[in-house]
């Protein structure tokens, strides 16, 4: 632990003014693991002037960073790039004349306290004024900047010509695309200072490339994957003052696939579990020993979880007997194609068959094994996937 600092397994604090620290505290190799440090408190360190790009990166678990009553003048743009857990930053009473929003844009900060710094009135700090205006009143700070006459001016009164928030407008075609096809999105940005344009595609799987020239940009997505259905694509305009974005959701249509079909399991009911993917929503049809299976209140399809274009469910059977043993085929179909899979189901042995000689039969015995299950006595239901037991749980990825 550096002189003038104290270190515990989760905290570093440097408060002793002399000799003080001249650089951001770093832990010695083979001492405390920097990843476990959640709080760094620095006070009275007049010779600490800079936070370099790599000073803080080792402290990936850092949540609270406090540097107060010190000499901080400059913070490198990428200083906090690796510190995604940072929630509270306090730079009160330092020597900061400017601070860019680029330092913090990737962080989900609860607090950014900057009072008592000699900020210069310029477009560089207009983002702070914007930030103050969007905050609820109890959280606002008395921030000031020094104007051309070196007079302290409340940031709330700061007016800088040609210094405003940018705008982004996405000209997107109908973003419903068939799997394997391509699409191009166009975006125009504007503002003063002139913003930069970039695309936020999140975790898009499909191959994509962008072209940007000044205030226009295009994003071409090729050989679109069904995995990208429901994902959001954003065009972002960013300048010194802040950012604006325009977003579209991608809908990918594709033929159904049955990704999972298993032998029956017994819980409250018997269940033949399945997972089907497809968009638009596929219609499901069951076949029993090759013939259409007419569903009833004793044997029916239940969808338990819907995850955008993926459906997890069961063919649910109430008290099946040996009469229900056989081959079950699931067919999923939409306008782009169909898929089918089959499993063999064995619910129970025929009456009078000794279990000992049939070890493959499941260990399930029903007292009233002669009761029929009433299958086949109803007309075939709608071939759309029935409404779910569990509410739609669309997990959209951003």
């Amino acid at each position: 632990c550096p002189t003038s600092c104290k270190c515990s397994s989760a905290r570093i604090w440097c408060t002793e003014p002399s000799p003080g620290i001249v650089a951001f505290p770093r832990l010695e190799p083979n001492s405390v693991d920097p990843e476990n440090i959640t709080e760094i408190l620095i006070a009275n360190q007049k010779r600490l002037e800079i936070i370099n790009e790599d000073d803080v990166e080792a402290y990936v678990g850092l949540r609270n960073l406090t540097i107060v009553d010190s000499g901080l003048k400059f913070v490198a743009y990428k200083a906090f790039l690796k510190n995604s857990n940072l929630r509270h930053i306090n730079f009160t009473r330092n020597k900061l004349t400017s601070l860019s929003r680029r330092h913090f844009r990737h962080l989900d900060l609860s607090d950014l306290i900057l009072t008592g710094n000699p900020f210069t009135c310029s477009c560089d700090i207009m983002w702070l004024k914007t930030l103050q205006e969007t905050k609820s009143s109890p959280d606002t700070q008395d921030l000031y900047c020094l104007n051309e006459s070196s007079k302290n001016m409340p940031l709330a009164n700061l007016q800088i010509p040609n210094c405003g928030l940018p705008s982004a407008r996405l000209a997107a075609p109908n973003l419903t695309v068939e799997e394997g096809k391509s699409v191009t999105l166009s975006c125009s940005v504007g503002g003063d200072p002139l913003p930069t344009l970039y695309w936020d595609v999140g975790n898009l799987v499909s191959k994509h490339m962008n072209e940007t020239s000044h205030t226009q940009g295009s994003l071409r997505i090729t050989n679109i994957s069904s995995d990208d259905s429901g994902k959001q694509i954003s065009c972002v305009a960013e300048n010194l003052v802040g950012e604006d974005q325009d977003s579209v959701n991608l809908t990918v249509h594709f033929a159904p696939t049955i990704t999972f079909l298993e032998s029956p399991t017994s819980d409250h009911h018997w269940c033949i579990p399945f997972t089907v993917r497809g968009n638009p929503k596929p219609a499901l049809q069951w076949f029993y020993n090759g013939a259409i299976l007419n569903e009833s209140k004793y044997i029916c399809t239940k969808i338990h979880v819907t995850n955008h274009t993926e459906y997890h469910g069961c063919l649910q059977l109430d008290n099946p007997t040996h009469m229900n043993n056989g081959d079950y085929t699931l067919m999923a179909k939409n306008e782009y194609g169909k898929d089918e899979r089959q499993i063999s189901a064995h619910f129970m042995g025929r009456p009078g068959v000794d279990y000992e000689t049939n070890p493959n039969y499941p260990e399930v015995l029903y007292e009233d094994w002669t009761t029929p299950t009433d299958i086949g006595d109803t007309t075939n239901k709608s071939n759309e996937i029935p409404s779910t037991d569990v509410a739609d749980q669309s997990n959209r990825e951003h």
Partner: antibody, heavy 116, light 110 residues
Framework: QVQLVQSGAEVKKPGESLKISCKGS????????IGWVRQMPGKGLEWMGI????????RYSPSFQGQVTISADKSISTAYLQWSSLKASDTAMYYC?????????WGQGTMVTVSS | LPVLTQPPSASGTPGQRVTISCSGS????????VSWYQQLPGSAPKLLIY???QRPSGVPDRFSGSKSGTSASLAISGLQSEDEADYYC???????????FGTGTQLTVL
């Protein structure tokens, strides 16, 4: 060489004001904290407060907060300790000291006598 | 006001080794560095030990410092008559946001 030179002894009456000085030389005066220490006759050392001449930031001991004012003029590399209204109990030797690795450089001391 | 506690006096004969203790709390000695000062009669204090156990140049190696928990100590070996002085410990106190001195120890060389 690095040194701190303090102003001469003072004899004052209760209620009077006083400002004593401590001039640094031989080092970057604005880059080190300067502290003031009181020693009453026959007693131990008492830390009063510090100032960072680079930006005049000060810290006071709770015992001396509001009783004295510490200031600095970086243009002439001088730190000050002042009283607006002296009391007999302010009679003491006052030292200034540079804070680095410990208080490594001390002034020779200024004797302040307050008597009616 | 919290101060660091030292024995009021200590003594030893020439050549002997004496130790002066300095007891504090977690907010000062326990969490910060300790320095030691020697004040010869009629003189300004002089830095003897900094950062718990470091000697400035010019200070004889007969003087050594150590710290354990919330206590620190100054050891003087091979005691000499010119070591007769007052000795003070000091440390930054986090709860006060300021320095604190010890009560002082008067060392007599018999």
């Amino acid at each position: 060489q690095v040194q701190l030179v303090q102003s001469g002894a003072e004899v004052k009456k209760p209620g009077e004001s006083l400002k004593i000085s401590c001039k640094g030389s031989g080092y970057s005066f604005t880059s080190y904290w300067i502290g003031w220490v009181r020693q009453m006759p026959g007693k131990g050392l008492e830390w009063m407060g510090i100032i960072y001449p680079g930006d005049s930031d000060t810290r006071y001991s709770p015992s001396f907060q509001g009783q004295v004012t510490i200031s600095a003029d970086k243009s002439i590399s001088t730190a000050y300790l002042q009283w607006s209204s002296l009391k007999a109990s302010d009679t003491a030797m006052y030292y200034c000291a540079r804070h680095d690795y410990g208080m490594d450089v001390w002034g020779q001391g200024t004797m302040v006598t307050v008597s009616s | 006001l919290p101060v660091l506690t030292q024995p009021p006096s200590a003594s030893g004969t020439p050549g002997q080794r004496v130790t002066i203790s300095c007891s504090g709390s977690r907010s000062n000695v326990g969490g910060n560095t300790v320095s030691w000062y020697q004040q010869l009669p009629g003189s300004a204090p002089k830095l003897l030990i900094y950062t718990n156990n470091q000697r400035p140049s010019g200070v004889p190696d007969r003087f050594s410092g150590s710290k354990s928990g919330t206590s620190a100590s100054l050891a003087i070996s091979g005691l000499q008559s010119e070591d007769e002085a007052d000795y003070y410990c000091a440390a930054w106190d986090d709860s006060l946001n300021g320095y604190v001195f010890g009560t002082g120890t008067q060392l007599t060389v018999l």
